[in-house]
Amino acid sequence: AGVFELQIHSFGPGPGPGAPRSPCSARGPCRLFFRVCLKPGLSEEAAESPCALGAALSARGPVYTEQPEAPAPDLPLPNGLLQVPFRDAWPGTFSLIIETWREELGDQIGGPAWSLLARVTRRRRLAAGGPWARDIQRAGAWELRFSYRARCELPAVGTACTRLCRPRSAPSRCGPGLRPCAPLEDECEAPPVCRAGCSLEHGFCEQPGECRCLEGWTGPLCMVPASTSSCLGLRGPSSATTGCLVPGPGPCDGNPCANGGSCSETPGSFECTCPRGFYGLRCEVSGVTCADGPCFNGGLCVGGADPDSAYICHCPPGFQGSNCEKRVDRCSLQPCRNGGLCLDLGHALRCRCRAGFAGPRCEHNLDDCAGRACANGGTCVEGGGAHRCSCALGFGGRDCRERADPCAARPCAHGGRCYAHFSGLVCACAPGYMGSRCEFPVHPDGVSALPAAPPGLRPGDPQRYL
């Protein structure tokens, strides 16, 4: 038995451009907390698989309020270690998952919202009792600095916490070569059961310090494959110097214990010692229960109808996953119609509609022209969610309230003069051109004439609208 300890030193924006200034969203202040999850072995496990070696949750950190102009420092973190106790042997190889969670403290209906900010997953080898291992990991734009170690809890000692210390009343009780069991002076180490380094898979021992080999293996530590002939005919313990042995079939052969369970022989049978999170005769049943607190983000753990059935998490709106660990991007489904802007408020979706549309999902097309008068004889045209006025000649602007100068665009070609007229405009063409916009040259044999200005208008007069 022992404890895995994780110390978070810092969590903050990683180096380089695009680093976030704040872990908080625009909704307001937030605070951080961490979750550590330990899984046995080095295999890539599904994110949803249980933390069979254990898990722990930190306290909440101090409230962080972004200072917009300040550089983003390391963020205020929860105090103290994260400790994950383990009951059985320390496996040595394990997967370490560290999650940084954000608790938003803004004005949320029903309270704060939790979301996963960063997840670091690393496969590691680590002996119990060793020094702190330091690490720096990146998760997206964030950087996490941390240290970790595994330590045994007395009376367990050793790199796997499988050797036991035994109490002693006097120094003479410690056998030859056995040291006091640090850090307690009045205890000493139990002798190592096998010679140091003896193969766990291919060796065994009956006396302290020996290393006897199973069939097909040889060498002082049973690491060397041997030709099977050297052991032919041998049954039971061998007196040969190679230490070769062909054991009779035992109940623990092939290790019937699943999920990292350790097998021990009992009279005529075997017994599996299961890692945390598993139980059953062969550790075949996943034993994560509601008591382990597997549901995050306010999820409710609903146990099965009987103790052997798995839990399920009922997730609050906005979260999903077997442990409510994934935030749902509900806006990705584009629920707002007609170009509406989607806002995920946590407790609900809100659509901000474009002009001319309304309804929870902007599904209602308003009558754009209702109550919208176009002045000066203009007519209202619906379309695109916003009303538009088609103005009478001589008027312009959104509501046809502005006077328009039909000559402003210089519509008369080839030097023709433009005269504003109540019905539009008239072009007085220069010699050699004709047409309503003076666009056509007069044929060489034709006669050109400068049209007279319309009655009551002289070139250059201000426009008059009748």
């Epitope: 209906i109 309270g111 607190g293 409710l300 753990c301 609903v302 609050p316 709106p317 979706l349």
Partner: antibody, heavy 118, light 108 residues
Amino acid sequence: QVQLQEWGPGLVKPSETLSLTCTVSGASISSFYWSWIRQPPGKGLEWIGYIYYSGTTNYNPSLKSRVTISVDTSKNQLSLKLSSVTAADTAVYYCARIAVAGFFFDYWGQGTLVTVSS
Amino acid sequence: EIVLTQSPGTLSLSPGERATLSCRASQSVNKNYLAWYQQKPGQAPRLLIYGASSRATGIPDRFSGSGSGTDFTLTISRLEPEDFAVYYCQQYDRSPLTFGGGTKVDIK
């Protein structure tokens, strides 16, 4: 402002089915879990069950065999049916909204007293 | 199921005094998923605290919650006349959702 209003018969005969409806205003029934809770006169609170618009339900094991909770999203209503009632089911029945941050109750109806008596 | 035991059953205090209400769980409540409610006669309960220590919207800061694991406390720093009521705790860690039996705070 979120408001919940329970309504239904105030008197139910033993062995019959108690039926109550809760009308929600100020919040979409599709955006939250909704629950029923009851309180016998002079006693504490007892959770009956909850529902999500998708059909997810969860009932108190002590009442599970007799309870059905349903929602009508078009009317923004939830309903409670409790069958085979006895005098022990006499209580004030509350509908309540379950918060987003967890399965606690942030808005409650004013409650309706249902008496089981012949 | 998690059984919540509230103590004392009744707390007799005067306005201005400090009230300390206890809620003890039969099993550890994970992630401090515990809420407190206030109920006055003839009214529905009102949410005060969630997450063991977070005040709900509009709740005065004289109400505070603390605790973790199996032991939780609601503290009213200075009792106001409107605070005399029954207080319930509720766990929402696992199903079934359960309430404590309540603590009545009445005027001495």
